[in-house]
């Protein structure tokens, strides 16, 4: 015998209180597959979360973060405070990058400036709290009679991680 519940499509549930007929999901709930005996309650985007995609009878709501915050974790499970470029988030809030480190994004940690000498190059543009150093040609390339220097690549623009 076929399970009568298997005929219930997504967006409905097999209602034991009504002789296993297919009932529509109650408000603010959904079933994304057929044959379900309950509908799942929709995620509520509250607090620092805001609704990115409304719940429907067949799919859950999706959240992102209110301005000044960014998503962390799969499915935007948490919202973390944004900081300015040149800062990182600590337990005590946003703090400026220490000398010798930089952060060119509104999230993440301060990273050490590139050590140009490790690649045998010189510092063309000094680093700041917001930007990495720009390494230029090696000191040997700057000796008299050396071939012309290719202009350095511009410093990276702030990255935008996918949410």
């Amino acid at each position: 015998l076929q399970d009568p519940c298997s005929n219930c499509p997504a967006g409905t549930f097999c209602d034991n209180n009504r002789n296993q007929i297919c009932s529509p999901c109650p408000p603010n709930s959904f079933s994304s597959a057929g044959g379900q005996r309950t509908c799942d309650i929709c995620r509520q985007c509250k607090g620092v979360f805001r609704t990115r995609k409304e719940c429907s009878s067949t799919s859950n709501a999706e959240c992102d973060c209110t301005p000044g915050f960014h998503c962390l974790g799969a499915g935007c499970s948490m919202c973390e405070q944004d900081c300015k470029q040149g800062q990182e988030l600590t337990k005590k809030g946003c703090k400026d990058c220490c000398f010798g480190t930089f952060n060119d994004q509104k999230r993440g940690i301060c990273r050490p400036w590139t050590n140009c000498s490790l690649d045998g190059k010189s510092v063309l543009v000094n680093g700041t709290k917001e930007r990495d150093v720009v390494c230029g040609p090696s000191p040997a390339d700057l000796s008299p009679g050396a071939s012309s220097v290719t202009p350095p690549a511009p410093a990276r623009e702030p990255g935008h991680s996918p949410q």
Epitope: K46, G47, L72, G73
Partner: antibody
Framework: QVQLQESGPGLVKPSETLSLTCTVS????????WSWIRQPPGKGLEWIGY???????NYNPSLKSRVTISVDTSKNQFSLKLSSVTAADTAVYYC????????????WGQGTLVTVSS | EIVMTQSPLSLPVTPGEPASISCRSS???????????LDWYLQKPGQSPQLLIY???NRASGVPDRFSGSGSGTDFTLKISRVEAEDVGVYYC?????????FGQGTKLEIK
């Protein structure tokens, strides 16, 4: 349908660490939040904390210094550790699926009684 | 944290008669999205709690329609239109607006 099953020692000595595991069957742990809730004998319900499958956690401030919740998606399990237990931690411990990160516990385990005693 | 207060704590009811449980929160549970973030649970003797009502007034799928939730802001009510023997147990309201979610003390419904 989603089912949750708690497992772990029923007796823990004072000052030791309580460790419980919740196994999720009939659905993937890789969505939703997953909570631990406890109920001392004859008393009401207290939320302990939740974890999202990606590892994000949130704990009740009253227990935060003693609680760790972790997840193992490969085993479809999440776990509770509560350190430095006392007799006041004696309770039935429930795991539950949390629809919104601190709201609407739609699916519950059957609960497991943990007694703290020497 | 938000404090939840239920009344009465004990509720003897005759089968077939209606029953009503009150729940009050220490701050409004009405969020800007228009929903009241309040749940009702029933814990039958020897069992885990089960969700009856979410967002103040929405019956969870599979919950008999004799159960209804109402109210807004800080004052909420769970009504059972006709109590049946299987409805005995402890009823809890829970606020789901802020973490930590917090429960009321519980209302024990018993059959007269």
């Amino acid at each position: 349908q989603v089912q949750l099953q708690e497992s772990g020692p029923g007796l823990v000595k004072p000052s030791e660490t309580l460790s419980l595991t919740c196994t999720v069957s009939g659905g993937s742990i890789s969505s939703y939040y997953w909570s631990w809730i406890r109920q001392p004998p004859g008393k009401g319900l207290e939320w302990i904390g939740y974890i999202y499958y990606s590892g994000s956690t949130n704990y009740n401030p009253s227990l935060k210094s003693r609680v760790t919740i972790s997840v193992d998606t490969s085993k479809n399990q999440f776990s509770l550790k509560l350190s430095s237990v006392t007799a006041a931690d004696t309770a039935v411990y429930y795991c539950a699926r949390d629809q919104s990160g601190g709201g609407s516990f739609q699916h519950w385990g059957q609960g497991t009684l943990v007694t703290v005693s020497s | 944290e938000i404090v939840m207060t239920q009344s009465p704590l004990s509720l003897p009811v005759t089968p077939g008669e209606p029953a009503s449980i009150s729940c009050r929160s220490s701050q409004s549970l009405l969020y800007s999205n228009g929903y009241n973030h309040l749940d009702w649970y029933l814990q039958k003797p020897g069992q885990s709690p089960q969700l009856l009502i979410y967002l103040g007034s929405n019956r969870a799928s599979g919950v008999p329609d004799r159960f209804s939730g109402s109210g807004s802001g800080t004052d909420f009510t769970l009504k059972i239109s006709r109590v049946e023997a299987e409805d005995v147990g402890v009823y809890y309201c829970m606020q789901a607006l802020q973490t930590p979610p917090t429960f009321g003390q519980g209302t024990k419904l018993e059959i007269k």
